[in-house]
């Protein structure tokens, strides 16, 4: 009679993570008597996957009933496959022995490859805000995919970026892989509404790439421009001075009026107007009682934006042309407003 052969008909099996892998194995004879075992890997370091004699295998089931006397089908199913299950599986026939069974014949092996989807890309930007014209770095990470081949692209508002570096780890063989990419983006004043997108394409995604996004509104700081102007006289001895704070982002802003270097009033930007590009405008005004001043007055609008060092703009108020009123000691009325209710 012909000697028993162990046949593993599939050289390789490709399974998606979470699915069930079927590893096929048949024997050509019932003789010699002895159990079948499944191993992952070969040699002394192999891992026992299934033992016909004993053991507990929560994820492994046999395709046929191995207790039947004439059974020659030793195929197994492995459920809930993960990338860690990848490897070459061998169906091995043992000959009954004493005290131990002896390995008799091994199949040629079936390579199990696991396709695992990458995790949703996570995009993170710099820890601190930056101003236009500065270059900032964004990182994109995705994990747990297999096989290793993967494509990553960066976009800013739909336009593909070219200044980025990508690494896939580990370099050698692994059950699953991670990708890490860093892109450099130059900020412009119009970037408050801009988005940076990291796009990952992988064989498991069937042409529908995963995207991670970051809003540049979290990254950019657009410093304000200041303009101080003197309005026409409202009353005989009062001058209206306005400070226009334009094109700033984010909204966090504090304004201080100084008269000849002395603090007159401090206020926080509240009712701002938003520009189409996402930046803000705000206006503050000061009524100056010129009759309280004998000399010219230097008015300064000082703005602290988003915790940055203050910027200021000054205006010299000529008072020599105004008649001096005696008995008045109020230099400025403590009233401020936004631009909607000035007049």
């Amino acid at each position: 009679e012909e000697e028993l052969q162990v046949i593993q008909p599939d050289k390789s099996v490709l399974v998606a993570a979470g699915e069930t892998a079927t590893l096929r194995c048949t024997a050509t004879s019932l003789i010699p008597v002895g159990p079948i075992q499944w191993f992952r890997g070969a040699g002394p370091g192999r891992e026992l996957i299934y033992n016909q004699k004993e053991g507990h295998f929560p994820r492994v089931t046999t395709v046929s009933d191995l207790t039947k006397r004439n059974n020659m089908d030793f195929s197994i199913r492995i459920g809930n496959i993960t990338p860690a299950d990848a490897g070459t599986y061998y169906c091995v026939k043992f000959r009954k022995g004493s005290p131990d069974d002896v390995e008799f014949k091994s199949g040629a092996g079936t390579e199990l490859s696991v396709r695992a989807k990458p995790s949703a890309p996570v995009v993170s930007g710099p820890a601190a805000r930056a101003t236009p014209q500065h270059t900032v770095s964004f990182t994109c990470e995705s994990h747990g995919f297999s096989p290793r081949d993967i494509t990553l692209k960066w976009f800013k508002n739909g336009n593909e970026l070219s200044d980025f570096q990508t690494n896939v780890d580990p370099v050698g063989e692994s059950v699953s892989y991670s990708i890490h990419s860093t892109a450099k983006v130059v900020l412009t004043r119009e970037d408050v509404h801009s988005q940076v997108i990291c796009e990952v394409a992988h064989v498991t995604l069937q042409g529908d790439p995963l995207r991670g996004t970051a809003n540049l509104s979290e990254t950019i700081r657009v410093p304000p421009t200041l303009e101080v102007t003197q309005q026409p006289v409202r009353a005989e001895n009062q001058v209206n001075v306005t400070c226009q704070v334009r094109k700033f982002y984010p909204q966090r802003l504090q304004l201080t009026w100084l008269e000849n270097g002395n603090v007159s009033r401090t206020e926080t930007a509240s009712t701002v107007t938003e520009n189409k590009d996402g930046t803000y405008n705000w206006m503050s005004w000061l009524l100056v009682n010129v009759s309280a001043h004998r000399d010219d007055v230097k008015l300064t609008c000082q703005v602290e934006h988003d915790g940055q060092p203050a910027v200021s703009k000054s205006h010299d108020l000529k008072v020599s042309a105004h008649p001096k009123e005696q008995g008045s000691n109020t230099a400025a009325e403590n009233t401020g407003s936004n631009e909607r209710n000035i007049y």
Epitope: G45, Y50, G55, R59, V60
Partner: nanobody, 124 residues
Framework: QVQLQESGGGVVQAGDSLRLSCVAS????????MGWFRQAPGKEREFVAG????????YYADSMKGRFTISRDNAKNLVYLQMNSLKPEDTAVYYC?????????????????WGQGTQVTVSS
């Protein structure tokens, strides 16, 4: 070389549960089959449970089947033994063992490395 350190032992009442942990260091944990053994006073060391390197196959001594569960966390280099419905006869020093090769309940023969053990006492 592999270093093994057991923890989680203690004194419990009959019927209680206990979870033993064993942390391994010094070699790639995912290349090691792991097992638990115990030795009661005046008795030989006996096999309790074993688990293959990926965790796909597990083995239990007949007297512990259904009460004890072995598991592992390859990311943390840990192997666990969850012991439920403990009996006074489960009182023993429990040892963690690591094997470079593993053939089911043949593990006592194959174990290359052993921990120092953790005492479990079950009082009635």
């Amino acid at each position: 070389q592999v270093q093994l350190q057991e923890s989680g032992g203690g004194v419990v009442q009959a019927g209680d549960s206990l979870r033993l942990s064993c942390v391994a260091s010094g070699r790639a944990f995912s290349s090691l089959d792991m097992g638990w053994f115990r030795q009661a006073p005046g008795k030989e060391r006996e096999f309790v449970a074993g688990i293959s390197r990926s965790g796909i196959s597990q083995y239990y001594a007949d007297s512990m089947k259904g009460r004890f569960t072995i598991s592992r966390d390859n990311a943390k280099n840990l192997v666990y033994l969850q012991m439920n419905s403990l009996k006074p006869e489960d009182t023993a020093v429990y040892y963690c063992a690591a094997a470079l090769t593993f053939r089911g309940s043949d593990l006592p023969r194959d174990s290359n490395y052993w921990g120092q053990g953790t005492q479990v006492t079950v009082s009635s």
